[in-house]
């Protein structure tokens, strides 16, 4: 449900990862979108502390660009999803081992909350950069 508004990213966690002065989509299904989305990222980043040095920067970029999606220019506030190819590169190339562990934990119900699920995109559901190069964001 893409109900929300666009605003400059004013948080801290993703500041070094997002494009400079990024205008991001804030989802109004949360009472306080900025705070809720920042908390989502913060929680997920803590789990990334244990991943490999190869995986971590790629995962951080994926995470921040998924939770704080860039706004698309236009008369209705619309988030730009990550391109499927970039998501798959993180899942199958940079973080293959970690992604498998995470999926295993999810199946076995080992996560204390559902929060991490919101911060991990389903790559297969994302648009391909080959369909329309402007319809998705490149990491």
């Amino acid at each position: 449900d893409n109900k929300g508004y666009c605003a400059q990213y004013r948080g801290e966690v993703c500041n070094a990862v997002l494009a400079k002065d990024a205008l991001v989509f804030l989802n109004t299904s949360y009472a306080d979108p900025e705070e809720a989305q920042e908390l989502l990222v913060h929680t997920a980043w803590n789990e990334l502390k244990v991943v490999s040095p190869v995986c971590r920067p790629a995962a951080e970029a994926l995470l921040c660009n998924h939770i704080f999606q860039e706004c698309s220019p236009g008369v209705v506030p619309t988030p730009i999803p990550i391109c499927r190819e970039y998501c798959l590169a993180v899942k199958e190339l940079f973080c293959a081992k970690e992604w498998l562990v995470m999926e295993e934990k999810t199946h076995r119900g080992l996560y204390r909350s559902e929060m991490h699920l919101l911060s991990v995109p389903e790559c297969s559901k994302l648009p391909s950069m080959h369909w329309d190069p402007t319809a998705c964001a490149r990491l």
Partner: antibody, heavy 118, light 108 residues
Framework: QVHLVQSGAEVKKPGASVKVSCKAS????????MHWVRQAPGQGLEWMGW????????SYAQKFQGRVTMTRDTSISTAYMELSRLISDDTAVYYC???????????WGQGTMVTVSS | SYVLTQPPSVSVAPGQTARITCGGN??????VHWYQQKPGQAPVLVVY???DRPSGIPERFSGSNSGNTATLTISRVEAGDEADYYC???????????FGTGTKVTVL
């Protein structure tokens, strides 16, 4: 067609207040921050502050803190800027402006001339 | 507070190139936007995010940004380009938006 239409010119006495309106059309009003910018005669552009039309949250330039109030009425897609304790230096054209999915101001109102004179 | 400095005026002959600078501390780390304003009119965005152009703005308008200086370049200048030009940034630390001092471009 995207438009920001502002209220008409005002003449005020020093010490009075002025309230300028900015009616948005052609886009989702609550989806983008509304900014207010002023320009004194022969001078440059000066940012005054913004309002988030969705939440009503505001941020004001330090210079106007305590003297400016920005509000909105989402039912009529209108933003307001009220400036109190007017002095002659507040004589200026006041603009509302917004950015539709970009971080710059790509739509502007036509401007409202406010003259402060005794 | 963050300060943006522009030259007060730039003169250029028709068909030549005008370059307007905007100086600010580490401005290269910020997104810079440029506005054109003609007398009695509201400003018009001509370049945003350093170098992007809104639809309807001629390719003659281009921007760059690095270090402590951002530049708006108007190539093949026309008489209709005569106007005031302002740079603008968002200062993240104060959450304030800042305009440059403005540059008057005169076409000779």
């Amino acid at each position: 067609q995207v438009h920001l239409v502002q209220s008409g010119a005002e003449v005020k006495k020093p010490g009075a207040s002025v309230k300028v309106s900015c009616k948005a059309s052609g886009y989702t009003f609550t989806g983008y921050y509304m900014h207010w910018v002023r320009q004194a005669p022969g001078q440059g552009l000066e940012w005054m502050g913004w309002i988030n039309p969705y939440s009503g949250g505001t941020s004001y330039a330090q210079k106007f803190q305590g003297r400016v109030t920005m509000t909105r009425d989402t039912s009529i897609s209108t933003a307001y800027m009220e400036l109190s304790r007017l002095i002659s230096d507040d004589t200026a054209v006041y603009y509302c402006a917004s950015g539709l999915g970009i971080s710059a101001f790509d739509i502007w109102g036509q401007g409202t001339m406010v003259t402060v004179s005794s | 507070s963050y300060v943006l400095t522009q030259p007060p005026s730039v003169s250029v002959a028709p068909g030549q190139t005008a370059r307007i600078t905007c100086g600010g501390n580490n401005i290269g780390s910020k997104s810079v936007h440029w506005y054109q304003q003609k007398p009695g009119q509201a400003p018009v965005l001509v370049v945003y995010d350093d170098s992007d152009r809104p639809s309807g703005i001629p390719e003659r308008f281009s921007g760059s940004n690095s270090g402590n200086t951002a530049t708006l370049t108007i190539s093949r200048v026309e008489a209709g380009d005569e106007a005031d030009y302002y740079c603008q940034v968002w200062d993240r630390s104060s959450d304030h938006y800042v305009f440059g001092t403005g540059t008057k471009v005169t076409v000779l």
